[in-house]
């Protein structure tokens, strides 16, 4: 990962900002409200901070989603864009700001009285849409905190990992997201070597469990670096 240019107290390994990226109409590039950092004897702010490159929504902030900055642009170049407010057009839930979700191409409120029924409809409706639900149900709605009093079991539809019971994570499965088991030691895991590879996964694996990390299997020697098998291993 690339280092940022601020200071050693920063989250350095998040990718540095891209220059000159502009959002397409109705999708403003998100701008940080100013970053504080120690500069001499007083704090200075940086107001013209640019967005981060990303491979998936989870790499962006909670008020952002990951997409190509221009319509019909290079699919490989994605950045974190500001989330869409209510009544704005959308293609998937993650595009909508917290408290909203994507229904029939429009961001609507995650009203707790009717949301549960509509989420089932949305799976069916979205099936044929132009890659609209590859990223499935994402983290933005208030579903887990306001509606699900019991955590989702394996196979339950989810929006984020906190919707799932302990030992499970929320991962893509076809065109939705379901609770799947967190990976155990020795299990095959996915290590994304190239940015943008996440979007191709319609059967997403969970992350490795506590105390484990996804690393190349030591005895797995293949000619191609990218095809090496990764497994969950103790730190």
């Amino acid at each position: 990962t690339l280092n940022s240019v601020l200071n050693s107290n920063a989250i350095k390994n998040l990718p540095p900002p891209l220059g000159g990226a502009a959002g397409h109409p109705g999708s403003a590039v998100s701008a940080a409200p100013g970053i504080l950092y120690p500069g001499g004897n007083k704090y200075q702010t940086i107001d013209n901070y640019q967005p981060y490159p990303c491979a998936e929504d989870e790499e962006c902030g909670t008020d952002e989603y990951c997409a190509s900055p221009t319509r019909g642009g290079d699919a490989g170049v994605q950045i974190c864009l500001a989330c869409r407010k209510r009544r704005k057009r959308c293609m998937r839930h993650a595009m909508c700001c917290p408290g909203n979700y994507c229904k029939n191409g429009i961001c609507v409120s995650s009203d707790q009285n009717h949301f549960r029924g509509e989420i089932e409809e949305t799976i069916t409706e979205s099936f044929g849409n132009d890659h609209s639900t590859l990223d499935g149900y994402s983290r933005r709605t208030t579903l887990s905190s306001k509606m699900y009093h019991t955590k989702g079991q394996e196979g339950s539809v989810c929006l984020r990992s906190s919707d799932c019971a302990s030992g499970l994570c929320c991962a893509r499965h076809f065109w939705s997201k379901i609770c799947k088991p967190v990976l155990k030691e020795g299990q095959v895991c996915t290590k994304h070597r190239r940015k943008g590879s996440h979007g191709l996964e319609i059967f997403q694996r969970c992350y490795c469990g506590e105390g484990l990390s996804c690393r190349i299997q030591k005895d797995h020697h293949q000619a191609s670096n990218s095809s090496r098998l990764h497994t969950c291993q103790r730190h």
Epitope: E58, E59, G61, T62
Partner: nanobody, 125 residues
Framework: EVQLVESGGGLVQAGGSLRLSCTAS????????VGWFRQAPRKEREFVTA????????DYADSVKGRFTISRDNAKNTAWLQMNSLKPEDTAVYYC??????????????????WGQGTQVTVSS
């Protein structure tokens, strides 16, 4: 509002391991960046590592890369710092901190708005 409590500190020999936990109360935890900082005697507080709201992005100070691992479980409102191959120079009070992760961008320690009380880690040679 997020309250953070660190645990898991202690005395360990050089080369040993410790795992620190940071347990949060408050619903904002799952949408926050979580970072670990440390402060050794007579030294300034320094950044150790951080993880974004989803766990998809992590960062480490050069001095701990390859030895420390940060992880989190939003369902448990907890973050962990696994510290391996500890060195005497890792001796410090370790603080867990959290800050808004609304936008994917660099955070400095001044933007971490919630802090724990700290847990002492002592590495003997």
């Amino acid at each position: 509002e997020v309250q953070l409590v660190e645990s898991g500190g202690g005395l360990v020999q050089a080369g040993g391991s410790l795992r620190l936990s940071c347990t949060a109360s408050g619903s904002a935890f799952s949408s926050s960046v979580v970072g670990w900082f440390r402060q050794a005697p007579r030294k300034e507080r320094e950044f150790v590592t951080a993880i974004n709201w989803s766990g998809a992005r992590t960062d480490y100070a050069d001095s701990v890369k390859g030895r420390f691992t940060i992880s989190r479980d939003n369902a448990k409102n907890t973050a962990w710092l696994q510290m391996n191959s500890l060195k005497p120079e890792d001796t410090a009070v370790y603080y867990c901190a959290a800050g808004s992760d609304r936008y994917a961008r660099v955070l400095t320690e001044y933007e971490y708005v919630w802090w724990g009380q700290g847990t002492q880690v002592t590495v003997s040679s």
